[in-house]
Interface confidence: low
């Protein structure tokens, strides 16, 4: 069971400093972006991470959404990342959901986080280059120290 | 290489709960990354997706099966089990058991040879 | 619930011919999130493709898919005896995870 606590508007960026942002295909994609690229890009580039109390503890469980026309809510349906046209609702009666993260620091680097599927344990939010694009995916922890699921969260509130 | 053997009985009565087991071997259920899955197969039929495992013992379900469903796992035994109950003959089928690729998506690389269940009194 | 539309069912074809399978979604199967298995009789189903045109480990090279959104195809550039057997899409965009119905490749 999941129950919605409160939510707050960040910047995601990958550790190579781009910025995830959600394209006019409603895909999530990482991107250079200066300080004024990312404020001119709103609200594509802010994303609403809503915290939810999790019945069984295992990192804070969170949505992410954004706020274009409508609100779009990130889902790892069969592990494939994907925006959803839904509200982050308001109670889940489930132990897991293809919507709900938990947020987690990294290990000895507070400033780092990782976000793991709540429906598919052991796959994480990543970044991966595809062609010219930089893609959210999910994907499986492979490694120890696997810079390519690790993201930093600034507080836009 | 990973290969995958389902066990059980061939025939079921209706009403009845199937329960088949997958046992598999040249490599750890519990290595991470794959969900264990089961698939079947109506007589010249096409396939369906049952549902599958991850070796932490979390669990998706085809949602036209599901309050009849149970998949489990036994990472001591290198197994993963399906029960279904209250069967009936539109349950006959061959049953695949079978390990998923990893990474994005679920498509499926290995498959056990499949056994032939048969629902009738 | 995507449903998956193969076509035709049967083909029948010679050795050394080019085989076109097609597959129809009933809606978009976006990102390309399709996959293609070949089986043979009393024999479980085989990884081809995935990724709409990403050949497993092992596939030879006359097997190749493309296609996008709604339509999809499995193209086999010159039929070997050993690939006369029915031929399944498979998509994994949207749950449940389904099939299509098949098409079978028989020797003309």
């Known amino acids: 069971y999941f129950g919605k606590l409160e939510s707050k508007l960040s910047v995601i960026r990958n550790l190579n400093d781009q910025v995830l942002f959600i394209d006019q295909g409603n895909r999530p994609l990482f991107e250079d972006m200066t300080d004024s690229d990312c404020r001119d890009n709103a609200p594509r580039t802010i994303f609403i991470i809503s915290m939810y109390k999790d019945s069984q503890p295992r990192g804070m469980a969170v949505t992410i959404s954004v706020k274009c026309e409508k609100i779009s809510t990130l889902s790892c349906e069969n592990k494939i990342i994907s925006f959803k046209e839904m509200n982050p609702p308001d109670n889940i009666k489930d132990t897991k959901s293809d919507i709900i993260f938990f947020q987690r620091s990294v290990p000895g680097h507070d400033n780092k986080m990782q976000f793991e599927s709540s429906s598919y344990e052991g796959y994480f939010l990543a970044c991966e280059k595809e062609r010219d694009l930089f893609k959210l995916i999910l994907k499986k922890e492979d490694e120890l120290g696997d810079r390519s699921i690790m993201f930093t969260v600034q507080n836009e509130d | 290489e990973v290969q995958l053997q389902e066990s059980g009985p061939g025939l079921v009565t209706p009403s009845q709960t199937l329960s088949l087991t997958c046992t598999v071997s040249?490599?750890?259920?519990?290595?991470?990354?794959?969900?264990w899955t089961w698939i079947r197969q109506h007589p010249g039929k096409g396939l369906e997706w049952i549902g599958y495992?991850?070796?932490?013992?979390?669990?998706y379900y085809n949602p036209s099966l599901k309050s009849r469903l149970t998949i489990s796992v036994d990472t001591s035994k290198n197994q993963f089990s399906l029960k279904l109950s209250s069967v009936a003959a539109a349950d006959t089928a061959v049953y695949y058991c079978?390990?998923?690729?990893?990474?994005?998506?679920?498509?499926?690389?290995?498959w056990g040879q499949g056994t032939l269940v048969t629902v009738s009194s | 619930e995507i449903v998956l539309t193969q076509s035709p069912g049967t083909l029948s074809l010679s050795p050394g011919e080019r085989a076109t399978l097609s597959c129809r979604g009933s809606?978009?199967?976006?990102?390309?999130?399709l996959a293609w298995y070949q089986q043979k009789p009393g024999q479980a189903p085989r990884l081809l493709i995935y990724?709409?045109?990403i050949r497993a480990t092992g596939i030879p090279d006359r097997f190749s898919g493309s296609g996008s959104g709604t339509d999809f195809t499995l193209t086999i550039s010159r039929l070997e005896p050993e690939d006369f057997a029915v031929y399944y899409c498979?998509?994994?965009?949207?749950?449940?995870?389904?099939f299509g119905g098949g098409t079978k490749v028989e020797i003309k």
């Open positions: 079978a390990r998923d690729r990893g990474g994005s998506g679920s498509y499926w690389d290995y």
């Open positions: 040249g490599g750890s259920i519990s290595s991470g990354g794959h969900y």
């Open positions: 495992i991850y070796y932490s013992g979390s669990t």
């Open positions: 809606r978009s199967v976006s990102s390309g999130y």
């Open positions: 990724g709409v045109s």
């Open positions: 498979q998509q994994y965009h949207g749950s449940p995870l389904t």
